[in-house]
């Protein structure tokens, strides 16, 4: 591979990381943004970090990190933080790979325990201005009522949950339409996952490359 | 024309599990939900609950939690009901009926007994 | 859970005379969507329940006009404006405004 070669790859991994450190960035903006001006409340009181707002913020910061990282290692041609990119991809991939196995093999025990936290939070929904806020969203934004249906708020439903009498649960709903985009957000899965691995296979390669031509030059 | 078909009469021992099945025919099965209650002679009519079939919403009385459980399969437009754990209680007719926001148990099953005895 | 109090248990008509059925409700049936969800059923011997009242007042398909129904909030009547043979059986009053839906206990027509 020669310096031709070398230079094309250098500066598409840079714009490709650039365009993830914008986008990192506005995920992160907008996780901010969510955290100041809407309070979503908290759903789960036993994971109380798990606001939309966080996740927003983890998420961005994650990109961020990363393609910065990438953008860096590959525009200066430095060796530890391209291989500090690579492991970092490595990582985050394994750990998808690892998460989408167990989500596959215990959907129903975590079906069960996501039933059971949202059942608490129900039951705190009167008490706990927090709870009572994300409920409210949740119904409002998504049309739905309760977690399976209406039959959930025992002492009737709030003012949040639509009129109709009949009614579809929020989490009822939410798991259909995970169901029914299954195919969808599999293949929007594996896209991240390939250009994750691209995004390795391009940072070993420079990796490669610089130590090739430090010593074609004879550093 | 609309139509509840339910499965045949049961004869279960206590402590067993049975499985009763609706099949609708004639409308659009997943724009209903489907009812289910129970007639014990002496007893009237008691309302278990509800499922809304192609979708994972249910409504329970919560009188029967534990009890019964709903399933609907919208390939075969079967709705069905899981007693669990029978005593010579659950012994009764059961209906499947269908609900919505603009049509309310208009339309009945023929009904399944079910008899719990050692 | 909503109490459906009926009266009477049962009721003895001559063919071609008036019936009345009462319903009462141990709260509200109004939803917030402005319907009172309360039905009346028949249920002939040895067959399954059929739907004769809807929405109060609202005449089922099929269901001859000698039957009515009226009502609002917690008392509600259903009247038969002449008794026929075919009208024999139990009439049940249905609430599903409120969640456990809940039945009356029934009355029982007969034919003198």
């Known amino acids: 591979m020669g310096m031709s070669s070398l230079k094309l790859l250098k500066y598409v991994l840079f714009f490709f990381n650039l365009l993830f450190w914008i986008c990192g960035c506005c995920i992160l903006g907008f996780g901010i943004y969510l955290l100041i001006h809407n309070n979503f409340g908290v759903l789960f009181h036993n994971l109380p970090s798990l606001t939309l707002g966080n996740v927003f913020v983890i998420v961005g910061s994650i990109i961020m990190v990363v393609a910065f990282l990438g953008c860096m290692g590959s525009i200066k041609e430095n060796k530890c933080l391209l291989m500090s990119f690579f492991i970092l991809l490595l990582i985050i991939l394994l750990a998808e790979v690892t998460l989408a196995i167990l989500l596959f093999v215990y959907e129903q025990k975590l079906n069960e325990y996501v039933a059971k936290g949202l059942t608490d939070s129900i039951h705190r929904y009167h008490s706990d201005n927090s709870t009572k806020a994300a409920w409210d969203s949740i119904q409002s934004f998504l049309q739905c009522c309760g977690i399976n249906g209406t039959s959930d708020w025992t002492s009737g439903p709030p003012a949040s949950c639509p009129s109709d009498r009949k009614v579809e649960g929020c989490y009822a709903k939410a798991r259909l339409w995970f169901h029914s985009n299954f195919l969808y957000i599999g293949i929007i899965t594996i896209c991240v996952c390939v250009i994750e691995v691209l995004g390795m296979s391009f940072a070993l390669t420079l990796n490669c490359q610089i130590d090739k031509t430090s010593q074609t030059i004879g550093l | 024309q609309v139509q509840l078909q339910q499965s045949g009469t049961e004869l279960m021992k206590p402590g067993a599990s049975v499985k009763l099945s609706c099949k609708a025919t004639g409308y659009t099965f997943t724009g209903y939900w489907i009812e289910w209650v129970k007639q014990r002679p002496g007893h009237g009519l008691e309302w278990i609950g509800e499922i809304l079939p192609g979708s994972y919403s249910t409504n329970y009385n919560e009188k029967f939690k534990g009890k019964a459980t709903f399933t609907a399969d919208s390939s075969s437009n079967t709705a069905y009901m899981q007693l669990s754990s029978l005593t010579t209680e659950d012994s009764a007719i059961y209906y499947c009926?269908?609900?919505?926001?603009?049509?309310?148990?208009?339309?009945w099953g023929t009904g399944t007994t079910v008899t719990v005895s050692s | 859970d909503v109490v459906m109090t009926q009266t009477p248990l049962s009721l003895s008509v001559t063919i071609g005379q008036p019936a009345s059925i009462s319903c009462k409700s141990s709260?509200?049936?109004?939803?917030?969507?402005?319907?009172?969800?309360l039905n009346w059923l028949l249920q002939r011997p040895g067959q399954s329940p059929k739907l004769l009242i809807y929405l109060v007042s609202k005449l089922e398909s099929g269901i001859p006009d000698r039957f009515s129904g009226s009502g609002s909030g917690t008392d509600f009547t259903l009247k038969i404006s002449r008794v026929e043979v075919e009208d024999l059986g139990v009439y049940y009053c249905?609430?599903?405004?409120?969640?456990?839906?809940?039945f009356g206990s029934g009355t029982k027509l007969e034919i003198k």
């Open positions: 249905l609430q599903h405004t409120h969640f456990p839906y809940t």
């Open positions: 709260q509200s049936l109004l939803h917030r969507d402005g319907e009172t969800y």
């Open positions: 009926t269908r609900d919505s926001n603009y049509e309310w148990f208009d339309v």
